[in-house]
Structure formats: C-alpha cells, structure tokens
Interface confidence: medium
Amino acid sequence: DGHGGSWEQLIQERRSHQNNPAAHLTGANSSLTGSGGPLLWETQLGLAFLRGLDYHDGALVANKAGYYYIYSKVQLGGVGCPLGLASTITHGLYKRTPRYPEELELLVSQQSPCGRATSNSRVWWDSSFLGGVVHLEVGEEVVVRVLDERLVRLRDGTRSYFGAFMV
Amino acid sequence: DGHGGSWEQLIQERRSHQNNPAAHLTGANSSLTGSGGPLLWETQLGLAFLRGLDYHDGALVANKAGYYYIYSKVQLGGVGCPLGLASTITHGLYKRTPRYPEELELLVSQQSPCGRATSNSRVWWDSSFLGGVVHLEVGEEVVVRVLDERLVRLRDGTRSYFGAFMV
Amino acid sequence: DGHGGSWEQLIQERRSHQNNPAAHLTGANSSLTGSGGPLLWETQLGLAFLRGLDYHDGALVANKAGYYYIYSKVQLGGVGCPLGLASTITHGLYKRTPRYPEELELLVSQQSPCGRATSNSRVWWDSSFLGGVVHLEVGEEVVVRVLDERLVRLRDGTRSYFGAFMV
C-alpha cells in the first residue's frame, strides 16, 4: 500500500522513542568560566548525551520546534560565606532567540544557602533544582546561569547538570 | 492492507500512552530499613503504580531499553540535629547494572538541613528533589539512597517518593 | 487504502507531539488571593500556555485520562519571619475529583525557610520544587497550595509556576 517503509519506521519510532529529542549534560571542571557567561557542560562523557538536540557554548539548541521539559540542578556549597556574596544566589534557565537581543528568563530560583551552616560547622551544602515546560523554535537556545557561580560545586557530573526532552 | 490490527493498536497506543513505561513509588513505614541498603517503596497502594517497569528490593527495573527521566523527592525533618550527623545529608539516585560490580551515581544532592532551625524553634524541615534523564538497558536498576536516612520523614507517601518514565 | 487522512495525521502527531497534553502556568500578581483557596495562575501571557488541558480557578483540568507528570515551583522569600508564621511552610499539589468530597494530597513538601537568614542579613530566599507522575481521569483537577502563602514571591512568572504533561 505504499506506506510500508514509513509504517515500519513509525512502529519503530513508537516503540523505541528513538526520535524524541532529549539531552542530559553534566558539570565538569571547565563548567565555571568566571567570565560572566553561562555554565559550560560535558556533552559526551559519562552520563552526558545529546539526542536530537545540539550543543553550543553552554547552550542546548533545538533542532525541532516544540514544547520541551527543561531542567537543571546545581550543587552549592562552601565554608562560611565568601566575601562580597549577596544574600541571594540566583540559578536560572534562560532562552536565547534571534527574535530578541537579550536572554529571556524562563525558570529562576533564588536561595540564601549560607544561612544553612550549623552552629557546629561553618560548612554548608544546598541544592537548587529547576524544571518546567517551555516552547522552543528551531535554533533557539537554552543556557544555565548561576550568580554567584563561585559557590557551584561540580565534582563528578552527578551534582550539577542540565537537560531537556520534548513532551 | 494487512495493517488493520496493528494500525488500530498504534492509534490506540498513540492516544493513550498505554505502553510508555512509567512508575511512581511512594514512601511507607517500611521504607527505612536501617540496614545500609537503599530505601524501599510502596508499589501498589494509594498513588503508587508500575507501568512497564518492574520493582525489586527498592529498585525500579527497566523492561525496555531507552532514556528515562528518573526522579525522587525526600522529605527531611527533625527537632534539632541528631548525634553523629555529618554536616551533609546526601540524597541520590544510583544505577545497578550487571556490567559493573558497584552502584553508579546518577543524580546526587547534598544538603545541610539542620542549619534551618530558627532561633524560635528547633524544629526544621527541608526537602530534596532530584530529576534527570539517564539511559537504562533492560534489567538495569535504579535505587534511592539517603545518608543519613534517620532524617527522612515518610508519613503518607506524598512527601517522599521515587518515579520514572521513558522520554 | 482508506487510512490516508488518519495516517498522515498520525505521522504528524508523532513528529510534532501536537496532541500530547501539556501546560505551563506562571505566577502573577493575582496568584495570591488570601482567601484560603489555591494559588491562581496566568494561562496565556508570556511563557504560559495550555495544550490539551483546561484551566479553572487555579486548577489544571484533564481532558484526557492518563498518567501526567505534574510539577510546581514556588519562590519563597522575606525579611525575617512574619509574626504567627509556623516553623513550616507547606507547598503541595492536590487533586480534586468528583469521587471524593475533599482534595487529595498528591505531592507535598515542607520547608523551614526562615532559618536561612544569615547572621549578616535578615533577608532570606528559598525555593520549593515538586514533580511526580499521577493518574488523572477526565475532568479531574490539580491545584497548588502554599501555607503560608504570604511568603510566596511572584515577580515575573519565572520564579513560581505550575505545569503538567502526559507521559
């Protein structure tokens, strides 16, 4: 009936989700640039992968228009609070689009993690998770920013990460 | 055209998502074993369910290879800080695979929740959420661990939970 | 072969996810009512959208039965702690169904954010994220509640939000 190839392909797609865009990028030593730019990410090693999404200078880039669940977690930690630290740490996901000159805030969290040091210890840890559904056109990009990035702890890619999948 | 049955099935699948693996497991009184093992979960009662995934001794087990968004939340709480508590609580999702003898860290958070008690009250609460996309082969397992698990509050299955779905 | 229209539609659906229910609602000035009801949300402006889900008085309403990943984030913040504030803030997702007279707790977090003020500053910020898979029948509703809602910071729709998509 002429649908043969497409039919098999569709069955295959349905069964395996092979064509659904998804990505999970992990924190690495090179993630924190100190340049005021977004965090950079590992795209291939360990748990990191790209499927139907591209990566460019810290950004996940959509190859297919649609709604995506995007997410990021950052691990924060320190011993006491660094000098000059504002009482707020901002962790956000931002969209870059040719349609606007500036990045667009998508999902943002503000936290005051230094207040978590206990009376026994000046060491503190905190984690910030963001996730939500946003629309991306082909070529639009999503990046992660943390202000103040000095508090981001990277270690091994399991504590700070960034990902997305089409919904 | 010979595709009749399959065609209807495909339409049905597409419409209902019936075959997309998904699970949501909930905390129960038996979740905390004190044995050093992973947390255990309710799989059937209340909000808990398994669809296309298996469960075994605290682990979600993949029946179908692919990328899964896995997630867990644990509710932490206490009155003051327990003796012997490190300044860090670690909440993580870990993979068990026949290909490695040890569990593999997937997604991990560290928090210092006891620092959240206020001057007025020694009671404190904190919550840790983890979620991210990982690849699972058939038979590979994912478990949740919390160190120190004594701080996990279970109550009714809505505050501490563990789930996954294929993306 | 008689499948033509449906076939093309199915291909299209598969490629675009156009028929997969999804929504992302954002916080707005009108979100906090002070009435004891659930939070209200923006459904159209900015990043907010509804696709295959309805909205009614703060609730996402299912048009199609199935399993949904539902999520919400709320941004909390303040200067010191308001009088009468319990040591706990509760942020939860709740289901309304014709089958029960009362709302059903789905996913809940408790936090003690006021303890996060540092010794240098009485200003504190905290964020609560919830996400998990739940089953919804046609017409069932999900709402977000925060107790004490006086601590929710709305600003621009990026810090407090509510969404869902079918899995």
Partner: antibody, heavy 121, light 111 residues
C-alpha cells in the same frame, strides 16, 4: 540478644574523677547512640548526655557540660562516661542505655545493669 | 528544658483493677504526627525497662495490658488489669529535644 554490661561499683573522693565503661554486644554498635542516665538514691532519673559511636559525636545536658566526657571505642564496642570534679551529690547509680535508631524518638530500649558511684571523703 | 510532671506521686490499686497514670509536659512534644513521649517501669534494684515509645507504641515483649495515649502535652499510661509484677515505679520521658527529661515518677503500690 542486645546486652550492655557496665563496669563495677566505684568509691571516689570529692574532687576526683570516675570513668565508667559500658560494653555493648548483640547489635551494630556504631549505628545507635549510647545515652547515660543517673539516679541518685531514692530519686528520679536524670539524663547526662549521649555519644554516637559512629563518629564520636556527643550531646550533653548543660548541667553536666564541662564535667562529663562521653566517648566510645568502636574496636571494643565500649562506651565510656567520665565525670570529673566529683561532689557528694554525684553519688548515684549511673546507667548506660541504647538509644533508638531514629534519633527524633530517642527512647532507651536497652539498659545496662547500672554502676554505683559513691563520692565520700 | 521541657519539664515533665507526673501525677499522682503514689497510686494505690488492687490487683486485677485498672491503673491510669498521667504525665504532663511543659510544652508540646509533637512532631510530624508523632508524640515523643516514652514510658518506663523500674523495680527496686533494677534498671528501668521501656514499656511504651512515641506515646502509644508497645515495646516488643511488653504485655498488651499496657497501653499509652495522648498528644501535645498530656499523656496517659494505662494498665488494664494489674498483675502482681506490675507494682513498681513508672517514669515518663520526653525525647522531643535534649536535654531529654524524665518525670519524677509515679509509685504504683498494692492497695
């Protein structure tokens, strides 16, 4: 079965120190707090403090802070309570007790037999 | 610190009868749906023995005639039908926060 066996009775002079031992068996010593409670003759029970053998962390009743020292030896599964600058009012039976695993409900489910410490000049 | 007050100081009851012992905390000892109140029995020359933990849970090996109830600041230990071996001193203890404090005890004696 869980057992806590304490050292024998002691007689001490005022101003001296005493060290009481508590040897644990029948459970994972490093997973449970060991609490110390005393009981003066004909009186009620008074909590002194606790030690977590897993890492030696301690918590004290402010009344005894500075005078009581709680320690634990993982290699021998033995907890110790040392009380210094003894006075006559410290004459009491000193008990060690195992705390519950879940710290927020620190009930004492197993007790030692008690050690009588007499402070007399 | 949390002050625990037991009443009565002495209770005289006949064997086979019901005994009700009370304990009051100076502040609530409730947390997350549990009440952090425990009850112990002590006989002369012996160490205390745990009977009830978190207000109403019966410790393993303790006879079912013992039961605990209450929440917030007011708690009760009930012995439904007194046996000869039950005559002893009973202590309540809060484990809500340190210092963990005990009541002064209730002496249960044979009437």
């Amino acid at each position: 079965q869980v057992q806590l066996v304490q050292s024998g009775a002691e007689v001490k002079k005022p101003g001296a120190s005493v060290k009481v031992s508590c040897k644990a068996s029948g459970y994972t010593f490093t997973s449970y707090n060991v609490h110390w409670v005393r009981q003066a003759p004909g009186q009620g029970l008074e909590w002194i403090g606790a030690v977590y053998p897993g890492n030696g962390d301690t918590s004290y009743n402010q009344k005894f802070k500075g005078r009581a020292t709680l320690t634990a030896d993982k290699s021998t599964s033995t907890a110790y309570m040392e009380l210094s600058s003894l006075r006559s009012e410290d004459t009491a039976v000193y008990y060690c007790a195992r705390g519950s695993y879940y710290y927020t409900s620190s009930y004492f489910d197993h007790w030692g037999q008690g050690t009588l410490v007499t402070v007399s000049s | 610190e949390i002050v625990m007050t037991q009443s009565p100081a002495t209770l005289s009851v006949s064997p086979g009868e019901r005994a009700t012992l009370s304990c009051k905390a100076s502040q609530s000892v409730d947390f997350d749906g549990d009440s952090y109140m425990n009850w112990y029995q002590q006989k002369p020359g012996q160490a205390p023995r745990l009977l009830i933990y978190t207000a109403s849970n019966l410790e393993s090996g303790i006879p079912a005639r013992f039961s605990g109830s209450g929440s917030g600041t007011e708690f009760t230990l009930t012995i439904s039908s007194l046996q000869s071996e039950d005559f002893a001193v009973y202590y309540c203890q809060q484990s809500y926060e340190d210092p963990f404090t005990f009541g002064q005890g209730t002496k249960l004696e044979i009437k």
